[in-house]
Amino acid sequence: FEIALPRESNITVLIKLGTPTLLAKPCYIVISKRHITMLSIKSGERIVFTFSCQSPENHFVIEIQKNIDCMSGPCPFGEVQLQPSTSLLPTLNRTFIWDVKAHKSIGLELQFSIPRLRQIGPGESCPDGVTHSISGRIDATVVRIGTFCSNGTVSRIKMQEGVKMALHLPWFHPRNVSGFSIANRSSIKRLCIIESVFEGEGSATLMSANYPEGFPEDELMTWQFVVPAHLRASVSFLNFNLSNCERKEERVEYYIPGSTTNPEVFKLEDKQPGNMAGNFNLSLQGCDQDAQSPGILRLQFQVLVQHPQNESNKIYVVDLSNERAMSLTIEPRPVKQSRKFVPGCFVCLESRTCSSNLTLTSGSKHKISFLCDDLTRLWMNVEKTISCTDHRYCQRKSYSLQVPSDILHLPVELHDFSWKLLVPKDRLSLVLVPAQKLQQHTHEKPCNTSFSYLVASAIPSQDLYFGSFCPGGSIKQIQVKQNISVTLRTFAPSFQQEASRQGLTVSFIPYFKEEGVFTVTPDTKSKVYLRTPNWDRGLPSLTSVSWNISVPRDQVACLTFFKERSGVVCQTGRAFMIIQEQRTRAEEIFSLDEDVLPKPSFHHHSFWVNISNCSPTSGKQLDLLFSVTLTPRTVDLT
């Protein structure tokens, strides 16, 4: 190989060992039989050399640095050449470095031809191995603006006082042009300006200077986004840290065309603007840091540009001003991550503050809109607390557990609406009365409606799930001893059409000791399946539940248990079941931890089934499933 550098070219070539490899055979640069591992060639020198091995690219890298002095004379502006040409260099991983020094008052602009640049974060690499590392200067301090790959949105970077641009090319890469030009500009009065151009939908991730280290103290950095007017942009902060400020406040400022409040100032912890039409600027302003404990300011953010959806121009009013103790969250439904670009899906408050989740609270009227290609990617979860603190005031009081129509009119599917029903301990209990009788969901007879009610204890220490219930069954009411949560969960978009079938009334009633009582009025047409609460986990220790089963005068009920033995093994106490005729009070008692379960039995009058648990040994829980079937009486037994 021969490298000859013209005099006055201000170019230095350095060949040195790259990252050490585990290759056993070393490799040397050989110059007239001398072996070296580092070779420096300066302007005006001509050197002939070889390598002592077959694959020097596995060992060595080459750096070509050109110093451009704009202090003492005119600057060589325009397209930057690769000098010496890549064809004259050994095939090593090579880095071309341009170090431009200029006065503080001079602005320097790097212009990148297509493909534009895409910034990468620490630990990331470029698919083709071509990287652009750009740094600036504040007095004598070097500031890293960022590392970039090809195929992005960054078209121009403006700096002042100097710029260092390093273009890294892998040894096998055929590129023979720098891909950028340098222009002079007036002073930009800040650290740098990065211009990011979107031609269509897409996203860009960008970082503050020196990221992930700290942004220089009291500096200003601006990103200019060029977005076609027909598209919408949203900003989200992926990662940020705040330093300890002594004076001034760290902030981001937006210049948004058409805004009457330019610049719009946000704290880094605020929700950032979304649904912006056309071009906008974002600036990061540092502060004077505490000398003793400065901390670090850093920011990594994403700009997402996409087509406005039909929904994005519609404003929805969610009036929660008459509600109390209620919160509504619109959030992404869980989904497998896709590797290809997925347009963002945002919900916007007042059309400007957009984020992937939004929580609205009671007491106010909220205006929301959506910036989302597919609203099925979102769902709603609502929580409302109905509590009674004074038992004298609440007793016999009723509340309708109904999803408000404002919520049903939103274009987003309701997932859960949870009512937390709280009563004073040992003073009151609750009764749930559905508008339509309920069916308990079982494997034998699953619910196939578009929604269900999930009823569970709301006492933190108690793990008690009564079950899942849907309209169209035989359960007329459910009484529960203490605090519960009732969750209306939807399973299909058709819930909107079936919403009229929902309706549950809760009333506060005098306290009773049993954990739950189910009132069942079977229909003649079908078999009713019932199961103990906490199915699969077992009825909690020392818990008692009852079923009040009505039998019409002209019918006979067949009670059938679905296994021979309960399977429970008691550690302490006894588990038992009482089947009691309501008219005669005649009762049968079964020891569930000893006896076999009763064979199918026939009941001509309404009856009770009461199941009470012991403290079972782990793994030997109490789970019972039974059915009630009505058939017409054939003989009058009265």
Epitope: K25, K33, R34, M38, L39, I47, S52, C53
Partner: antibody
């Protein structure tokens, strides 16, 4: 482990010839440049010859040029030094050395005495 | 020919102290960003052993007590602290120009 073992030294009359051998093991011999270095009875070290890894390039100081020839057989992992027209000032301990970024590995040496 | 002059010719240093050996070249041994100067240690009955290559680089397996410095014509080998095992003759060698040459050696004695 890198090992270099010289042989072929001995007593020779002035004007005589001698061929030294250096058997190499523990490394890929064909990848390395080799040299001969000698140490006089006064303990002065002198570089004598250089050969590139493929054997295509050889270099000598003026003191031995035309009289000494360095060669190698990469198939046999052996380095040679053919010495002729020997002089009394060639009396020395002859070392073969592997040249990396300096003479990184040396053999134990073979003694050549030129005397009548 | 480049002549290498080592000084002192012999040196006695107490255990644990610093030993400094100098090597002066009759002309510069620097080129292409490198100083082509190497240092060797030789004990009686043994071949020389490479300690420092290209003026300041420690050969692998050599204790960090050994260090090299210098450029152009003036070079130094420093041993700090000296250990009993360091008693030997030390040579400098240049290969910037043909013929490659060695210094006359410095004999280090530990007292």
């Amino acid at each position: 482990e890198v090992q270099l073992q010289e042989s072929g030294g001995g007593l020779v009359q002035p004007g005589g010839s001698l061929k030294l051998s250096c058997a190499a093991s523990g490394f890929t011999f064909s990848s390395y440049t080799m040299s001969w270095v000698r140490q006089t009875p006064e303990k002065r070290l002198e570089w004598v010859a250089y050969i590139s890894n493929g054997g295509g390039s050889t270099y000598y100081p003026d003191t031995v040029k035309g009289r000494f020839t360095i060669s190698r057989d990469n198939a046999k992992n052996t380095l040679y030094l053919q010495m002729s027209s020997l002089k009394s000032e060639d009396t020395a301990m002859y070392y073969c050395a592997r040249y990396d970024l300096g003479f990184a590995y040396w053999g134990q040496g073979t003694l050549v005495t030129v005397s009548s | 020919n480049i002549v290498l002059t080592q000084s002192p010719a012999s040196l006695a240093v107490s255990l644990g102290q610093r030993a400094t050996i100098s090597c002066r070249a009759s002309e510069s041994v620097d080129s292409y960003g490198n100083s082509f100067m190497h240092w060797y240690q030789q004990k009686p009955g043994q071949p020389p052993k490479l300690l420092i290559f290209l003026a300041s680089n420690l050969e692998s397996g050599v204790p960090a007590r050994f260090s090299g410095s210098g450029s152009r014509t003036d070079f130094t080998l420093t041993i700090d602290p000296v250990e009993a095992d360091d008693a030997a003759t030390y040579y400098c060698q240049q290969n910037n120009e043909d013929p490659w040459t060695f210094g006359g050696g410095t004999n280090l004695e530990i007292i």
